[in-house]
């Protein structure tokens, strides 16, 4: 995993100090990948919490920086960066020692093989005449008397180390602050030197330039500044990362930077630098990370502290030990990638004297199978052999080797082959939006197999159809709009993903059923009339042009602007042209409009009508009762309504012959203080029904109905009249 944790040791001011974690993984930051995590790891080296919380700054998905340290003690301890997805999720650790500590490590990171002897050495920075305690992962391990210092150093020797011995070691003066400790990191490979894999039976590729062979996958973890399957190539000065793709920040290049890489490498200075602060250039004749490598150039080669020997014309090799007359395999990719099941052609070019010929070049697969070239191209300066590889399987992943052999000698070049599985969607595409004739689809789906995704092919066709699928190739990062579809139709939509290279097309993913919307209801209704049928009731009528109607019903919208409230009335009958709206608020100004709807789509609104509902009247008068006075007179008495909504302007009395079929008659009592009335002019021996209501701004509720009969033997009257102190008034009919 291409993951690097950088610490800038030149910055001693904690407030300016920062840690940066960089991922150079292909496809890093895919939306499905977990983000990079960079944090202080307090599980073993626990310091006081920082005065203020540390904060992360993300630069895209491939880089994260931790800042906000307020005091030197915030820096001491272990920091970790976690990156990669799934099985490739990897943690990189950095151990920071206080520059003012009592004890300081000669070397912080130690990588050793299983069974080796590890020596951790701490030199005295500020002497104390107390014992030195060694701890492993925070637990007591050993004690040294202060007088056991050898040449100002305390050493811990660990013999026959095993993987469980890995961890954080510390050396601390007794009764001194833990912040003054020397902190170390010991990494024990799971195999002996030069071995890897289950049972440690596989041979490491022979990592060059200080690269460390990974005990699980046999890959070389290259020091910063080197690349290639065996770390055989040096990057340009100031560059790092598995493909030399990253650049050290600032004008000083990689000076003062500590680089931490995935285990089993650990941490070191960048290529060309050494010292506890990584600020010292390599001494003459030395090069590489921590200047650990010696040039030993032959045949007039010169030593470059970043890349090693620079050979004069006619010579090559790590030490310029190889004559150009010995056959030499020319520039070849250190890593290639093919898709499973493909039959690629692999070329290998070589030069030398005598000239390599067809039979002198072979290709060795990881399982030991030798392939002979199927074609050879001879040019003045080289011979290129072409090998036709049988159908690749996942087992073909690993190190392949091109070999050339002539009477002048032999050469070989290893390169890594990665066999990839084309991606297959695990989920169906997702519907984002729909209209009557188009669907907006997100083609981004989770998938099995390998990325990166180079293209996405979307297939769609009507549900239950046997016609050929329509296909559209889309950008994987953008949503797709499928156009010119049929309204109200189900479409099956599925995705095919491809990765780069021949044979990179994966299989079809599951299909999703997506249905287009109804056609929009383009008709605009017109409001024709609106009638108030009571303080809380409104009768509305509308019209539509006599054209073909596509709609499911109407939506009546009443907007009460004063209260900021909207009421919607759904008329789910497309033939309706009138509606009675009830339960409205009396005394309210409403704006009313009507729209046609079809499925979930609304058509255009009618021009609005403005309606004012009258206020509601007062409650009913109480305790109405009637008493016959003669054969033509009945007295009515009542009490005022309880809590009328304003001053009562009048009472209205309703009179009706009991059991009669005629219309009722009404009388107004214009003096609201009066709560009784004598109704005159009634028929003798006749039963009457009476009720009364009050009026404020609007008419109130009717009282209870009372029944009373006039006395007998009177003459027939022309109709009832009320008693009045002024003049008699007729009835409203």
């Amino acid at each position: 995993v291409d993951l690097t944790l950088l610490a800038n040791l030149r910055i001693t001011d904690p407030q300016r100090f920062f840690l940066t974690c960089v991922s150079g993984e292909a496809g890093a930051g895919r939306s499905s990948d977990p983000p990079l995590l960079l944090e202080k790891d307090d599980r073993i080296v626990r310091t006081f919490p920082p005065g203020q919380p540390l904060y992360l700054a993300r630069n895209g998905s491939h880089q994260v920086t931790l800042r906000g340290f307020s005091k030197p003690s915030d820096l001491v301890g272990v920091f970790s960066c976690v990156g990669g997805a799934g099985a490739r999720r990897t943690r990189v650790l950095y151990v920071h020692n206080s520059p003012g500590a009592h004890l300081f490590p000669d070397k912080v990171t130690h990588t050793v093989n299983k069974g080796d002897t590890a020596v951790l050495s701490a030199h005295v920075h500020k002497e104390k005449q107390t014992d030195v305690i060694w701890k492993n992962n925070g637990s007591y391990f050993n004690t040294l008397d202060w007088q056991e210092a050898d040449d100002g150093r305390f050493q811990l020797q660990l013999q026959n180390v095993q993987p469980p011995s890995s961890g954080i070691y510390s050396a601390t003066y007794l009764e001194a602050s833990p912040l003054g400790s020397a902190f170390f990191r010991l990494i024990v490979r799971g195999c002996g030197a030069g071995r890897w894999g289950p049972g440690c039976v596989k041979d490491c590729p022979g990592c060059l330039h200080g690269g460390v062979c990974h005990d699980h996958d046999g890959e070389c973890v290259c020091p910063p500044g080197f690349t290639g399957t065996r770390c055989e190539q040096a990057c340009r000065e100031g560059r790092f990362g598995q493909s030399c793709q990253e650049q050290c920040p600032g004008t000083a290049g990689c000076r003062g930077l500590t680089f931490c890489l995935p285990d089993p490498y650990g941490c070191s200075c960048g290529s060309g630098w050494r010292g506890s602060q990584c600020q010292e250039a390599c001494a003459p004749g030395h090069f590489g990370a921590d200047c650990r490598l010696q040039c030993q150039c032959q045949n007039g080669g010169t030593c470059d502290r970043f890349s090693g020997c620079v050979c004069p014309s006619g010579w090559h090799g790590v030490h310029c030990e190889k004559s150009d007359r010995i056959p030499q395999i020319l520039s070849m990719a250190t890593e290639v990638e093919f898709n499973i099941g493909t039959m690629p052609r692999i070329n290998c070019a070589a030069a030398g004297n005598p000239f390599p010929v067809r039979g002198s070049m072979k290709l060795r697969k990881p399982d030991g199978t030798m392939l002979l070239s199927t074609k050879v191209i001879v040019e003045p300066d080289r011979t290129t052999a072409e090998f036709e590889v049988p159908s690749l399987t996942l087992g073909d992943s690993g190190f392949w080797e091109c070999r050339v052999s002539t009477s002048g000698g032999q050469d070989s070049r290893r390169f890594k082959v990665n066999v990839k599985v084309p991606p297959v969607p695990l989920t169906a595409p997702r519907l984002l939006a729909k209209q009557s004739r188009q669907l907006v689809v997100s083609p981004l789906v989770s998938f099995s197999g390998d990325g990166p995704i180079s293209s996405v092919r979307l297939h769609y066709r009507p549900q239950d159809s046997t016609i050929a699928w329509s296909a559209i190739v889309v950008d994987p990062s953008e949503n797709v709009t499928l156009m010119n579809l049929k309204p109200k139709t189900g479409y099956n939509v599925r995705v095919q993903l491809s990765r780069p290279g021949e044979g990179g097309e994966g299989g079809w993913g599951p299909s999703a059923l997506m249905t287009t919307d109804c056609p929009e209801p383009l008709l605009q209704p017109w409001l024709e009339s609106w009638h108030v049928e009571g303080p809380d009731r409104l009768r509305v009528s509308w019209s539509l042009p006599s054209v073909p109607l596509s709609g499911d019903g109407f939506l009546l919208r009443l907007w009460d602007g004063a209260r900021g409230q909207e009421r919607r009335e759904n008329i789910s009958f497309p033939q309706a042209r009138t509606a009675l709206l009830t339960g409205l608020t009396p005394g309210t100004h409403y704006q009313l409009d009507v729209r046609l709807y079809h499925c979930t789509l609304l058509g255009p609104a009618s021009p609005p009508a403005h309606v004012h509902l009258p206020p509601s009247g007062p409650p009913a008068p109480r305790h109405l009762h009637a008493q016959a006075l003669s054969d033509s007179e009945i007295q009515l008495m009542w009490q005022h309504p309880e809590a009328p909504s304003g001053p009562i302007s009048k009472y209205i009395v309703e009179i009706q012959v009991a059991g009669g079929s005629g219309d009722p008659q009404w009388m107004d009592v214009d003096r609201p203080e009066e709560t009784s009335i004598i109704v005159r002019g009634l028929n003798a021996s006749t039963r009457y029904l009476f009720r009364v209501r009050a009026s404020v701004q609007g008419l109130g509720d009717w009282s209870n109905t009372v029944e009373e009969a006039t006395l007998g033997n009177g003459l027939q009257s022309e109709g009832p009249v009320r008693e009045s102190r002024a003049a008699e008034e007729g009835l409203d009919q």
Partner: antibody
Framework: EVQLLESGGGLVQPGGSLRLSCAAS????????MVWVRQAPGKGLEWVSV????????GYADSVKGRFTISRDNSKNTLYLQMNSLRAEDTAVYYC?????????????WGQGTLVTVSS | DIQMTQSPSSLSASVGDRVTITCRAS??????LAWYQQKPGKVPKLLIY???TLQSGVPSRFSGSGSGTDFTLTISSLQPEDVATYYC?????????FGQGTRLEIK
């Protein structure tokens, strides 16, 4: 052929009144909604008012609400705009246009316009 | 009321250029939008209705797209006779407001 002919424009003082007419021919007038749109000199189009085919349903822009009244006489195939309390900002060419029958998607038929100038 | 905002307010392009004018509604208006062309001293002419339907007789270089709040009028290859002011208008709810217009001229 559908024709719309506006008349009644002219010079009027602020606070004054004017009545515009739009004579329609070439189609069944009583089956179509009608609108007024105006355009101040050198400015953009502004929707003013609408009336339904029967005349029962009207709508106005906020800028003219309470001052202008739209009406129609289907027996005379004529659309009207009664403009009261006129202001300087009402100066514009006034167009009448036919709303498509039921489908509110655009005005295809327009009159040639009549100029109303409000100035003292 | 629904506000309609056109951009740009004016633009200059060469003959043969692809020209795009956008219109944004302050709230969703479905497909209920029309585009007009008005030449100096002339009556507005309907180009596009219901957002994307070309009015008969209008050259096919004119096209409309969009729904909801964002709409586009495109002239695929600008011609000298296309110099005019272009307006959008919404028909979703009253008042049926217009955009402020986009003046198009030839470079």
């Amino acid at each position: 052929e559908v024709q719309l002919l506006e008349s009644g424009g002219g010079l009027v003082q602020p606070g004054g009144s004017l009545r515009l007419s739009c004579a329609a021919s070439g189609f069944t007038f009583s089956m179509y909604g009608m609108v007024w749109v105006r355009q101040a000199p050198g400015k953009g189009l502004e929707w003013v008012s609408v009336i339904s085919p029967s005349g029962g349903n009207t709508g106005y822009a906020d800028s003219v609400k309470g001052r202008f009244t739209i009406s129609r006489d289907n027996s005379k195939n004529t659309l009207y705009l009664q403009m009261n309390s006129l202001r300087a900002e009402d100066t514009a060419v006034y167009y009448c246009a036919r709303a498509p029958r039921g489908y509110s998607y655009g005005y295809y038929y327009w009159g040639q316009g009549t100029l109303v100038t409000v100035s003292s | 009321d629904i506000q309609m905002t056109q951009s740009p307010s004016s633009l200059s392009a060469s003959v043969g250029d692809r020209v795009t004018i956008t219109c944004r509604a302050s709230q969703g208006i479905g497909h209920y939008l029309a585009w007009y062309q008005q030449k100096p001293g002339k009556v507005p002419k309907l180009l596009i209705y219901t957002a994307s339907t070309l009015q008969s007789g209008v050259p096919s270089r004119f096209s409309g797209s969009g729904s909801g709040t964002d709409f586009t009028l495109t002239i695929s290859s600008l011609q000298p006779e296309d110099v005019a002011t272009y307006y959008c208008q919404q028909f979703n709810s009253y008042p049926h407001t217009f955009g402020q217009g986009t003046r198009l001229e030839i470079k």
